[in-house]
């Protein structure tokens, strides 16, 4: 996706000081999807627009972060700003859909990530590099920290795979891309096996 961060920042920077305060207050009470935590009040109230944007993306990922921002803006009566986010969401959706087309054949036979789960748990050593690549776009801040908290590479990979069932094709493609960059020979080996 990637566009969401810029879109959220533009929206938040286009709020007056009072509107940004109101946005934060509403963010503290807005109904969240199951499985998502709330940004701590103390930290939230101190944030400027750039910090808040990054926090929204790391806590809720780009797609839901964008949706949440839209919801709060609409609740504040700021339709115009919300509409612009809606446009970004639709554009990003089209891009994501287009990007996932080549992967349809792999979806039928099982994605690389699912097919090689055991081997990846056993053989990926540079887990932190993989996590950094997924941080904010696929993994929430909490998930990122949870994986990093594990001590061995295998445990980290097991923890990472515990989040995979809730991922879509784009998320799995992102993991595959990260693995290709960090462990190209491992990926090549597994693709040929």
């Amino acid at each position: 996706m990637g566009r969401a961060r810029d879109a959220i920042l533009d929206a938040l920077e286009n709020l007056s000081g009072d509107e940004l305060k109101k946005f934060k207050m509403k963010l503290l009470t807005v109904q969240l999807r199951e499985g998502y935590g709330r940004i701590p009040r103390g930290a939230l109230l101190q944030m400027d627009a750039i910090d808040l944007t990054d926090k929204l993306v790391s806590y809720y990922l780009e797609s839901y972060g964008l949706e949440l921002t839209m919801t709060v803006l609409r609740d504040m009566g700021l339709q115009e700003l919300a509409e612009q986010l809606q446009t970004t969401k639709e554009e990003s959706g089209a891009v994501a859909a287009a990007a996932s087309v080549p992967a349809q054949s792999t979806a039928r036979t099982g994605h690389f990530v699912d097919q090689h789960r055991q081997a990846l748990i056993a053989r990926v050593t540079e887990v932190d590099g993989v996590l950094d690549a997924l941080h904010g776009s696929v993994l929430t801040e909490g998930q990122y920290q949870a994986v990093r908290a594990e001590t061995t590479s295998q445990d980290k990979m097991r923890k990472l795979f515990s989040f995979v069932p809730s991922w879509n094709l784009t998320c799995k493609d992102s993991l595959l891309q990260a693995l290709k960059e960090i462990h190209p020979y491992l990926v090549m080996d597994l693709e040929q096996s």
Epitope: G2, D6, E13, N14, L81, Q177
Partner: antibody, heavy 112, light 106 residues
Framework: QVQLQQSGAELARPGASVKLSCKAS????????ISWVKQRTGQGLEWIGK????????YYDEKFKGKATLTADKPSTTAYMELRSLTSEDSAVYFC?????WGQGTTLTVSS | QIVLTQSPVIMSASPGEKVTITCSAS?????MYWFQQKPGTSPKFWIY???NLASGVPARFSGSGSGTSYSLTISRMEAEDAATYYC?????????FGGGTKLEIK
């Protein structure tokens, strides 16, 4: 399609002021921020600052504070940058840009 | 402010060659943006949020990195890729650009 149309080339005297314009079309003017970027001949890009038209929030690189003033006129969907106390160092091409679209640039020449 | 240092400053590559341009930040940034500029024209938005290609950018381009280290890679150099490339951070005000990398074709 977002378009940014910048004003024409300017020739100014040292010590004078000049106001460059950037007319936006094809998107909701108040929903984007507009950045201004300087490029001297054969040199790299320098970020001057940014204005968010709806809120009026502005951010500047310290180097350009006191030199550049960014404003925006919502009814005409136009952003402006005023440069004051001009010197030869201000001779450059100035671009306006939104998230991912750029204007064609305005060439400013400061000469006596 | 965050200083971005690009390397190399100038380089030339043969058609078909792999090219990597790096951008190092003086402190950690969340994303990197890349622009392509050819002489006498406005910069073009090229890669956004570290690794996403802007509309119309050929698939031979890719972007990667995190923290303070980012890169733009061309898998197989083509004549039309000869240009100057700039990185930009939008994580902290003032936003800043790298000094640019001029890429020439051999």
């Amino acid at each position: 399609q977002v378009q940014l149309q910048q004003s024409g080339a300017e020739l100014a005297r040292p010590g004078a002021s000049v106001k460059l314009s950037c007319k936006a079309s094809g998107h909701t003017f108040t929903s984007y921020g507009i950045s201004w970027v300087k490029q001297r001949t054969g040199q790299g890009l320098e970020w001057i600052g940014k204005i968010y038209p709806r809120s009026g929030n502005t951010y500047y690189d310290e180097k350009f504070k006191g030199k550049a003033t960014l404003t925006a006129d919502k009814p005409s969907t136009t952003a402006y940058m005023e440069l004051r106390s001009l010197t030869s160092e201000d001779s450059a091409v100035y671009f306006c840009a939104t998230r991912d679209y750029w204007g064609q640039g305005t060439t400013l020449t400061v000469s006596s | 402010q965050i200083v971005l240092t690009q390397s190399p400053v100038i380089m030339s590559a043969s058609p078909g060659e792999k090219v990597t341009i790096t951008c190092s930040a003086s402190s950690s940034v969340s994303y990197m943006y890349w622009f392509q500029q050819k002489p006498g024209t406005s910069p073009k938005f090229w890669i956004y949020s570290t690794s996403n290609l802007a509309s119309g950018v050929p698939a031979r381009f890719s972007g990667s990195g995190s923290g303070t280290s980012y890169s733009l890679t061309i898998s197989r150099m083509e004549a039309e890729d000869a240009a100057t490339y700039y990185c930009q951070q939008r994580s902290r005000y003032p936003w800043t650009f790298g000094g640019g990398t001029k890429l020439e074709i051999k």
